[in-house]
Amino acid sequence: SAHLHPRDSCPLGPGRCCHLETVQATLEDLGWSDWVLSPRQLQLSMCVGECPHLYRSANTHALIKARLHGLQPDRVPAPCCVPSSYTPVVLMHRTDSGVSLQTYDDLVAQGCHCA
Amino acid sequence: SAHLHPRDSCPLGPGRCCHLETVQATLEDLGWSDWVLSPRQLQLSMCVGECPHLYRSANTHALIKARLHGLQPDRVPAPCCVPSSYTPVVLMHRTDSGVSLQTYDDLVAQGCHCA
């Protein structure tokens, strides 16, 4: 709404607020080594960091959630940092007949917001 | 993926895991009393509760986030409880010419999942 203004500058200091971060993970870490063949190591972009009042609010719901959290912190949780979009990834799979390629549209985050 | 099985039973006990909860809020609570006329009190459905491993996972990203949180809890946050869908709400607005109705598609949560 025009009466609620989400903001993009982090009041907590650099790197503290909701942002995208790359985490290295092996197929073993993910428990996928029995059915995914490649890549053996994945660069997984994930959303991490805090969501202070009005920071990168996803929508009207997130804005009012932030406001109500300020009023009733025990009752209403603060918004949290989650993916706003994803980037597709292609994996090589083990199949009965050999190897196949499969795309995942919801595996690696591309952007983050506070919801 | 067929190799990852999100679950719907809460291992923490009744009401502890991610679910929809109704929160009463006045226009004053929301800071909307200067421009919204009605309703004066809103029943806001919000997503609250914890997201233990594999509980109501939103997608593949949430499943691997849960797994990596178990391996690197300081680096990777646990999934958190956010709206999976919304229900539209109509508000009566004050305008320069009088009163108008406006629909908000993203104000009240209808369902929740762990993202």
């Epitope: 063949l37 490649s38 890549p39 053996r40 190591q41 660069q43 980037t87 597709p88 990834v89 292609v90 994996l91 090589m92 190897v99 390629l101 795309t103 549209d105 690696v108 | -």
Partner: antibody, heavy 119, light 110 residues
Framework: EVQLVQSGAEVKKPGESLKISCKGS????????IGWVRQMPGKGLEWMGV????????IYSPSFQGQVTISADKSISTAYLQWSSLKASDTAMYYC????????????WGQGTLVTVSS | QSVLTQPPSVSGAPGQRVTISCSGS????????VNWYQQLPGTAPKLLIY???NRPSGVPDRFSGSKSGTSASLAITGLQAEDEADYYC??????????FGGGTKLTVLG
């Protein structure tokens, strides 16, 4: 600097065998897939297949399955494309290309190897 | 016959804006990103746009990509003589994996 350097042009007769190469440098060769792309004279690009140089897993386009073999030797950072019995219709420019991080596009290309098959 | 359909040729005068379309289906462009490659005469293809609208470093901002539904397009503004090349779109198809458009020859007039 990322580079893919391909072997030189080849002139062959129908029925002969051939193996062309693509050497990667300037990056971790085993961390990125390598694809092969054909371009027949005056025509467009056709994806032939892909190899993971780390585990040597290969996947072929249905159009090229059984027609060519893709392989790699990670000890010398080189991928290969080979034919056991060439046909005149194999005359084309062949490119190797490195896949981007998530395997959805080709971010670096070799200069191409022209293969001419004629009796 | 390419899975992705491009016009065989487009042309424009220096300084003009041209667009190249790439039409697919719900099994390719409809579900995955589109990438664009430029092939200058006698050279290897070069990545121009990836993931619908991202430019690799070194690609001028005169080049931009977009996607809507099962179609994508490449726009070139401030056309220059050195933009004369073949342009290919590429996506993923559930049946044949990586697919290219048939290519579009861009001619810079004058």
């Amino acid at each position: 600097e990322v580079q893919l350097v391909q072997s030189g042009a080849e002139v062959k007769k129908p029925g002969e065998s051939l193996k062309i190469s693509c050497k990667g440098s300037g990056y971790s060769f085993t961390s990125y897939w390598i694809g092969w792309v054909r371009q027949m004279p005056g025509k467009g690009l056709e994806w032939m297949g892909v190899i993971d140089p780390d585990g040597s897993y290969t996947i072929y386009s249905p159009s090229f399955q059984g027609q060519v073999t893709i392989s790699a030797d990670k000890s010398i950072s080189t991928a290969y494309l080979q034919w056991s019995s060439l046909k005149a219709s194999d005359t084309a420019m062949y490119y190797c290309a490195r896949y981007g991080r998530y395997g959805t596009y080709f971010d670096y290309w070799g200069q191409g190897t022209l293969v001419t098959v004629s009796s | 016959q390419s899975v992705l359909t491009q016009p065989p040729s487009v042309s424009g005068a220096p300084g003009q804006r041209v667009t190249i379309s790439c039409s697919g289906s719900s099994s390719n462009i409809g579900v995955l990103y589109v990438n664009w490659y430029q092939q200058l005469p006698g050279t290897a293809p070069k990545l121009l746009i990836y993931s619908n609208d991202n430019r690799p470093s070194g690609v001028p901002d005169r080049f931009s990509g977009s996607k809507s539904g099962t179609s994508a397009s490449l726009a070139i503004t401030g056309l220059q003589a050195e933009d004369e090349a073949d342009y290919y779109c590429q996506s993923w198809d559930s049946s044949s994996n990586y697919v290219f458009g048939g290519g579009t020859k861009l001619t810079v007039l004058g």
